[in-house]
């Protein structure tokens, strides 16, 4: 049993950090293999992980984390029974793809404008809080090529548009993604999308 | 072996400005974050705020805010609080705490005295 | 802000009998990662507080086996199966999943 393609993780610098690798062949993760990860510190502990499969050969693990700090240095060994398989370790400010927005809601009653409003994923004390900018997905559910990104590069979670900037009387759907350009993350996840139908009323054309 | 040393005691007048310092030794703050507990005399343990030594991310109880400031300098492995416009309600046992993530570290606390 | 209110706020124990404090927290105490991030500290006479207890009921390194922590949601408990005389001092909870952290007021503790 060997490793065909080396643990790389991605951290969403709060609580989780998901490592994926692949085998040499089809391999059961789950009763096969142990991820052991230790935190570079004084007095932290020993950790396991229980890989779970990820196609044949493919296996991903999710490492819980109490907190993170930027300096923060992990040890990564994994283990098939009593054979060490691979070596390794991981900084998980190095490799940060932030937690998906939430609750996206669009307030149609705004005198025709569209206020998109969605929740930041971290709490107050997390750095990432006061350092995340989002893009917001906005496309017609009926026309393919009505799609369009806007780009949030405010601390604020939200958007405002003129309802008029769309077609009326049609449905259109949005999410809405965020990142963080302090640690050079990944882009999120988009979040769950929501739906709704644009009308506003045209201006009344005077001849 | 680790430790977190303090600086001395403080006997300043009201309305002046003074900085605490928390130096560590047998680990780097930036392993960890640096948290500042106020005990007033004869009374509880109070929360004032923390610090992320490596980025300098601070955040703070709200009744300590524009009257608290943490900073660090990780060259000298060192935490600092300044506290501004001393009233005797600062008077008090300030206590400089490592937390990795719970309190596992504590100086042996600085008093301050704030008296005319 | 997160209030942590404790019970009592002092007791009396004769060496070898058991003790118990109660800490309750105005709102749940889970943090967004799912963890709870309650503690307890000892405050022994002229000292810094020490570590007792971290995450409800893990016990610190060196911190003997009569002390144990329980609880979820928004009630906590500390007991102590036989106090020592080495025990006394002031007991305080901690809220550390929501800022601003927030301890309780504290509990002194003496021996009879």
């Known amino acids: 049993m060997k490793v065909l393609q080396e643990p790389t993780c991605v951290s969403d610098y709060m609580s989780i950090s998901t490592c994926e690798w692949k085998m040499n062949g089809p391999t059961n993760c789950s009763t096969e293999l142990r991820l052991l990860y230790q935190l570079v510190f004084l007095l932290s502990e020993a950790h396991t992980c229980i890989p779970e499969n990820n196609g044949g050969a493919g296996c991903v693990c999710h490492l819980l984390m109490d907190d993170v700090v930027s300096a923060d240095n992990y040890t990564l060994d994994l283990w098939a029974g009593q054979q060490l398989l691979w070596k390794g370790s991981f900084k998980p400010s190095e490799h940060v793809k932030p937690r998906a927005p939430g609750n996206l809601t669009v307030h149609t009653n705004v005198s025709d404008t569209l206020l998109l409003t969605w929740s930041n994923p971290y709490p107050p004390d997390n750095y990432l809080y006061n350092h995340l900018t989002y893009a917001v997905n906005i496309w017609s559910e009926n026309d393919p090529a009505d799609f369009r990104i806007y780009n949030v590069t405010y601390l604020e979670p939200s958007l405002r548009i003129a309802a008029s900037t769309l077609k009326s009387g049609i449905s259109y759907r949005a999410r809405v993604r965020a990142w963080a350009q302090c640690y050079n993350t990944t882009w999120s996840e988009w979040s769950p999308s929501t739906k709704w139908h644009n009308s506003y009323r045209e201006p009344f054309e005077q001849h | 072996q680790v430790q977190l040393q303090q600086s001395g005691a403080e006997l300043v007048k009201p309305g002046a400005s003074v900085k605490l310092s928390c130096t560590a030794s047998?680990?780097?703050?930036?392993?960890?974050?640096m948290h500042w507990v106020k005990q007033r005399p004869e009374q509880g343990l109070e929360w004032v705020g923390r610090?992320?030594?490596?980025?300098?991310?601070?955040i703070y109880a709200s009744k300590f805010q524009g009257k608290a400031t943490i900073t660090a300098d990780t060259s000298s492995n060192t935490a600092y609080m300044q506290l501004s416009s001393l009233t005797s309600e600062d008077t008090a046992v300030y206590h400089c705490?490592?937390?990795?993530?719970?309190?596992?570290?504590w100086g042996q606390g600085t008093t301050l005295t704030v008296s005319s | 802000d997160i209030v942590m209110t404790q019970t009592p706020l002092s007791l009396s124990v004769t060496p070898g009998q058991p003790a118990s404090i109660s800490c309750r927290s105005s709102?749940?105490?889970?943090?967004?990662?799912?963890?709870?991030?309650l503690e307890w500290y000892l405050q022994k006479p002229g000292q810094s507080p020490q570590l007792l207890i971290y995450?409800?009921?893990n016990r610190f390194s060196g911190v003997p086996d009569r002390f144990s922590g329980s609880g979820s949601g928004t009630d906590f408990t500390l007991k102590i199966s036989r106090v020592e005389a080495e025990d006394v001092g002031v007991y305080y909870c901690?809220?550390?999943?929501?800022?601003?952290?927030?301890f309780g007021q504290g509990t002194k503790l003496e021996i009879k």
């Open positions: 705490v490592s937390r990795r993530p719970w309190f596992a570290y």
């Open positions: 047998g680990f780097n703050i930036k392993d960890t974050y």
């Open positions: 610090i992320d030594p490596t980025n300098g991310y601070t």
């Open positions: 709102q749940s105490i889970v943090h967004s990662n799912g963890n709870t991030y």
């Open positions: 995450k409800v009921t």
């Open positions: 901690f809220q550390g999943s929501h800022v601003p952290y927030t």
